[in-house]
Amino acid sequence: EEELQVIQPDKSVSVAAGESAILHCTVTSLIPVGPIQWFRGAGPARELIYNQKEGHFPRVTTVSESTKRENMDFSISISNITPADAGTYYCVKFRKGSPDTEFKSGAGTELSVRAKPSAPVVSGPAARATPQHTVSFTCESHGFSPRDITLKWFKNGNELSDFQTNVDPVGESVSYSIHSTAKVVLTREDVHSQVICEVAHVTLQGDPLRGTANLSETIRVPPTLEVTQQPVRAENQVNVTCQVRKFYPQRLQLTWLENGNVSRTETASTVTENKDGTYNWMSWLLVNVSAHRDDVKLTCQVEHDGQPAVSKSHDLKVSAHPKEQGSNTAAENTGSNERGSSDYKDDDDKHHHHHH
């Protein structure tokens, strides 16, 4: 009689996480009598996966009915595979005894687990930044196997090239993580922009996972200010407006100063939204010129999103009162934008709300 051989026909098996793995094993003889055991790994630290003779193995079922006469098929199915199940599995024949003793082992089957990466999580900087600044975004995805993975960055559909990616750990592992950092230069038009991290992996069948970050969470577009004098509404009254343009986010507080003294403070509420996502707002001040003997310096001071205030002033000369409505000769606009921002033409305003 030929000596029993343990045949494991599959050198390797690859299974998707969550599925069942079938590990094949047959023996070539009924002799010697004794049970089959399955182990993961070899040597003293090997892990028992299934013992035909005894034990409770809730995830393991035998593929064939091992009690049936002349059964030589000791293949097993392991349910609900996770990356932690990866390894080399050995089918081992034992010889009946007290105790049973190991007789012969199969050559082993390497089980690799295909595990999907987690949904990429994109996070931006903790604090907002202004246009022309470079900000960093990170993208993380975990739990995938095998190690090979592709990560790309996009801004509004345009692929980015300035990024660094690491896959950990470097050595063999049951599963892996990817971490990438991309640098993005902000522009004034980025309120509606998105940064996208795209992860492609063999488990995703060509349908990559995406994580997004809205630049509206990251960008701060500072306002430009323009103070103008409107035609006289009534005798001795001048209407001065402060146009606050192209700002984001909306959080904004405006203070009118007359000769350095606070006249009124208000918070932007009813604003105009521009097509690029920025906001416009206008405030006006009615100044009773007859109450002033000297020229009046009117200052529109804006605190935007908790940043240091910016202001723009307008000088009203009271020496010559306007004679007729609509004239702009009595008071000269000598204001300057103290922040130095250029004026914007508001062609893209959707609507105007005037706030008293």
Epitope: S66, R69, E70
Partner: antibody, heavy 119, light 110 residues
Framework: QVQLVQSGAEVKKPGASVKVSCKAS????????INWVRQAPGQGLEWIAM????????HYNQIFKDRATLTTDTSTSTAYMELRSLRSDDTAVYYC????????????WGRGTLVTVSS | DIVLTQSPDSLAVSLGERATINCRAS??????????IFWYQQKPGQPPKLLIY???NRDSGVPDRFSGSGSGTDFTLTISSLQAEDVAVYYC????????FGQGTKLEIK
């Protein structure tokens, strides 16, 4: 180690029934056949039947097919053999035995249960 | 059904001598390349103990003075050098079909 512990001796009257139990330990009960064999005083071994606890498949010696019933309780790893319509020549030691190689052989034996049928 | 006939019914052998017990089947017990014959030893007041399986394979813990041979219909259990503890009744069993036992052979010391 494998152990098969059988129930105690029984004395029965002719026409009665007896149910002998065999509690298994030291192995996975559902993975191996259980055989029942009897031996009348001073006589040889006589195979009665066998059962696969995993699915209750049974094979009977034709001589006992109409009078013997094998069952198992997997929750307690116990096998049972019931013999009905007892006669005096059913007096014997009844053994359970485990088949470790699915060869329809008897690798491990219980100590036996003496059943005496007497009026 | 396959009928097994053992011979002799009883046997007396001197200590250290060879003892041979035969078992003949009413038809071949060979199948799938195996001879489906088993040998058991039963000592008084004890259950039987498996000695040989599939005609020629010693069970675990069985001394190597016990051996089995044969094929088809004729099989032999041999004790090469009889020891005092070998006194017992020996049974052959077939499982080519459903199990049946031979009638037994009583082995004594001469």
């Amino acid at each position: 180690q494998v152990q098969l512990v059988q129930s105690g001796a029984e004395v029965k009257k002719p026409g009665a029934s007896v149910k002998v139990s065999c509690k298994a330990s030291g192995y996975t009960f559902t993975n191996y056949w259980i055989n029942w064999v009897r031996q009348a005083p001073g006589q040889g071994l006589e195979w009665i039947a066998m059962i696969d606890p995993s699915d209750s498949e049974t094979h009977y010696n034709q001589i006992f097919k109409d009078r013997a019933t094998l069952t198992t309780d997997t929750s307690t790893s116990t096998a049972y053999m019931e013999l009905r319509s007892l006669r005096s020549d059913d007096t014997a030691v009844y053994y359970c035995a485990m088949d470790y190689g699915s060869l329809y052989a008897m690798d491990y034996w219980g100590r036996g249960t003496l059943v005496t049928v007497s009026s | 059904d396959i009928v097994l006939t053992q011979s002799p019914d009883s046997l007396a052998v001197s200590l250290g001598e060879r003892a041979t017990i035969n078992c003949r089947a009413s038809k071949s017990v060979s199948s799938s390349g195996y001879n489906w014959i088993f040998w058991y030893q039963q000592k008084p007041g004890q259950p039987p103990k498996l000695l040989i399986y599939l005609a020629s394979n010693r069970d675990s813990g069985v001394p190597d003075r016990f051996s089995g041979s044969g094929s088809g219909t004729d099989f032999t259990l041999t004790i090469s050098s009889l020891q005092a503890e070998d006194v017992a009744v020996y049974y052959c069993q077939e499982s080519r079909e459903l199990p049946t036992f031979g009638q037994g052979t009583k082995l004594e010391i001469k």
